[in-house]
Interface confidence: medium
């Protein structure tokens, strides 16, 4: 099936009742598209990126927030944004690249020494359990004396990459995002042109380990461009 | 400590409607998807709905849609499903339950009886 | 949809004994499974997570196993606390769907 070729980086079309019927009329299901996965992505390059639209940061890629392009401009027009880099102005957690957080409006790096001093604005959990992940999607609560000494195992909630144990990633499935295996060589990988529009799909892959690129699996290249196949492959 | 508080079951007539809520403390309630679940008695579990923690995506099972509807109030922390047009078939304990059921509620009766 | 088989669907044990519950899906859901107690009259619990990973503040003598389509529930030494309903669930795809359960008695 297409999840054992997956690994766990589960991705699938919606079928109809989802992409469409599942979100009640009036619901922001086929409104709202969720993105595969990201757009900053450092293991991966996206062509023709195209801005896209998002109605909260879980529908962005781990790189990515979601918000209006211009300041003060229209909150109902929202996209996809690249996330801000250290010392860079923020307003929370999620506007930050993984690896910062969000303190005092400015984004700041969420290493294990600033973690037990500094963050006063994110409730550790994992999975809602006492472990150590960042819950859900936190944005602003308060910290127990519980410190930051593991991090998501598989298939724990988690905020961004950086919540989950070395070689997980942190993506979307359904309407939470979870820790989940990044890619190895060989594995189905997910290039995002960005054209058009997508249909709701809820389910993120990761992205390729170091040292891999997703691209174009060579017995595919004849293949017309909606079905090709990209894999992980060696640079 | 996480706790999901049930309520606006009863005794409601086939065709009729009802509203459940579900009062949510002991976590940030916006930063979870929640779902809601239930057992008619003496039977197993059924799935009836989700929702992201934004609001901005619902799902449902196949049996419910287009007759119940899910939403949220993050200012309130609390969780709503709308029944319309309710069923025999709709008896059960409706439990709210956070993330992927991480966590329940104690569950409230809904039963649908002439 | 995909169907979520438990079984044995009812077993009688002693407390002591290693008990072993399997479920078995339709389609490969890899590793997104969880297993849940349930007691008479309350919600159910979760036990583990991730087919594999133990819920916080569960004892350490339930684990799960599997990924897949084959998934298993061990109760290294059951105690008279585990006497329950235990489910199965799968939230590869939605619906999201659940065993039908497998009652866990004293012999």
């Known amino acids: 099936t297409l999840n054992s070729v997956l690994n766990s980086n589960a991705i699938k079309n919606l079928p109809p009742p989802l992409g469409g019927a599942a979100g009640h009329p009036g619901s922001a299901v086929s409104a709202a598209p969720g993105i595969l996965y990201p757009g900053g992505n450092k293991y991966q390059t996206i062509d023709n990126y195209q801005p896209y639209p998002c109605a909260e940061d879980e529908e962005c890629g781990t790189d990515e927030y979601c918000a209006s392009p211009t300041r003060g401009g229209d909150a109902g027009v929202q996209i996809c944004l690249a996330c801000r880099k250290r010392r860079k102005r923020c307003m929370r957690h999620a506007m930050c690249c993984p690896g910062n957080y969000c303190k005092n409006g400015i984004c700041v790096s969420s290493d294990q020494n600033n973690f037990r001093g500094e963050i006063e604005e994110t409730i550790t959990e994992s999975f809602g359990n006492d472990h150590s992940t960042l819950d859900g999607y936190s944005r602003r609560t308060t910290l127990s004396s519980k410190m930051y000494h593991s991090k998501g195992q598989e298939g724990s909630v988690c905020l961004r990459s950086s919540d989950c144990a070395t070689g997980l990633c942190c993506a979307r499935h359904f309407w939470s995002k979870i820790c989940k295996p990044v890619l190895k060589e060989g594995q189905v990988c997910t290039k995002h042109r960005r054209k058009g529009s997508h249909g709701l799909e809820i389910f993120q892959r990761c992205y390729c380990g170091e040292g891999l690129s997703c691209r174009i699996q060579k017995d595919h290249h004849q293949a017309s461009n909606s079905s090709r196949l990209h894999t992980c492959q060696r640079h | 400590q996480v706790q999901l508080v049930e309520s606006g079951g009863g005794l409601v007539q086939p065709g009729g409607s009802l509203r459940l809520s579900c009062a949510a403390s002991?976590?940030?309630?916006?930063?979870?998807?929640m779902s809601w679940v239930r057992q008619a008695p003496g039977k197993g579990l059924e799935w009836v709905s989700g929702?992201?923690?934004?609001?901005?995506?619902?799902y449902y099972a196949d049996s419910v849609k287009g007759r119940f509807t899910i939403s949220r109030d993050n200012s309130k922390n609390t969780l709503y499903l709308q029944m319309n047009s309710l069923r025999a078939e709709d008896t059960a304990v409706y439990y709210c339950?956070?993330?992927?059921?991480?966590?329940w509620g104690q569950g409230t009766l809904v039963t649908v009886s002439s | 949809d995909i169907q979520m088989t438990q079984s044995p669907s009812s077993l009688s044990a002693s407390v002591g004994d290693r008990v072993t519950i399997t479920c078995r899906a339709s389609?490969?859901?890899?590793?997104?499974l969880h297993w849940y107690q349930q007691k008479p009259g309350k919600a159910p619990k979760l036990l583990i997570y991730?087919?594999?990973n133990l819920q916080s503040g569960v004892p350490s003598r339930f684990s799960g196993s599997g990924s897949g389509t084959d998934f298993t529930l061990t109760i290294s030494s059951l105690q008279p606390e585990d006497f329950a309903v235990y489910y199965c669930?799968?939230?590869?795809?939605?619906?999201?769907?659940f065993g039908q359960g497998t009652k866990v008695e004293i012999k």
């Open positions: 389609q490969d859901i890899s590793n997104y």
């Open positions: 339950a956070r993330h992927y059921m991480d966590h």
């Open positions: 002991g976590f940030t309630f916006s930063s979870y998807g």
């Open positions: 669930q799968q939230y590869d795809s939605i619906p999201m769907t």
């Open positions: 991730g087919a594999s």
């Open positions: 929702i992201s923690g934004s609001g901005s995506y619902t």
